[in-house]
Amino acid sequence: SGNSTRSPETNGLSCGYPGENCTATTVQPKRKGHFSRCPKQYKHYCIKGRCRFVVAEQTPSCICDEGYTGARCERVDLFY
């Protein structure tokens, strides 16, 4: 879906800080302080989506546009 993300705290995965990229895809709750603006250096990280920074892991995560999937929203979602 358009609100999918690859985030280090999904589906019970316990991911390390900083810089780990986990592989579960799920809808994330928007808890205050859980995400922040992505650092400028990650401006082009998300190919077909928008970037957010996972505060607990200090690593970027992508919220994919509808019809795209992958860690960087780089793949067309064949199931969309």
């Epitope: 922040s36 603006r37 650092p39 400028k40 690593t59």
Partner: antibody
Amino acid sequence: QVQLLESGGGLVQPGGSLRLSCAASGFTFSRYWISWVRQAPGKGLEWVSYIDSTGTFINYADSVKGRFTISRDNSKNTLYLQMNSLRAEDTAVYYCARGGSLFDYWGQGTLVTVSS
Amino acid sequence: DIQMTQSPSSLSASVGDRVTITCRASQGIISYLGWYQQKPGKAPKLLIYAASSLQSGVPSRFSGSGSGTDFTLTISSLQPEDFATYYCQQYDALNTFGQGTKVEIK
């Protein structure tokens, strides 16, 4: 425990090439961003490059752009830095470090000396 | 590029002293700042991330504060093992380090 072990350093002439390696163990290498950071003798730290977990997102410091290439082989748990057109000012200890924004584990470094 | 300026470049202190090191960014970096400790011949060690969060395993005498352009690392009571060089690092734009602050024994 997390370990990062750099190798490949040595003495090289200006204009020459060198390939550094960083062997990782103690964590799931394929899930982490990894960086190279260097330190010239008696000087401060300088970030060189990072690569994301899949090897598709890469950035370089301006000082090495076009001369250095970072890569990784997740099947071998190894990070690489191909250094071409080396200059005297590239002389430094080169560290690999876990992370892209911040660096929570570091290797002990490998010394690269560029001199004629 | 964002420049990071640390002050002082060196300081002398005694065991038990409160030590403060400052870091100024040439432009706003929100709270995208880390602090590292480095001892001679050793690799750096991450102390603080996100300006004020203590890295796991780091003693609570270390603390960080600040946001925007001005940041501070404080050691509340200097211990013998704290004599080292300290670096700040911004990670908003491409990663850059400060020039370092050497903490020496008085």
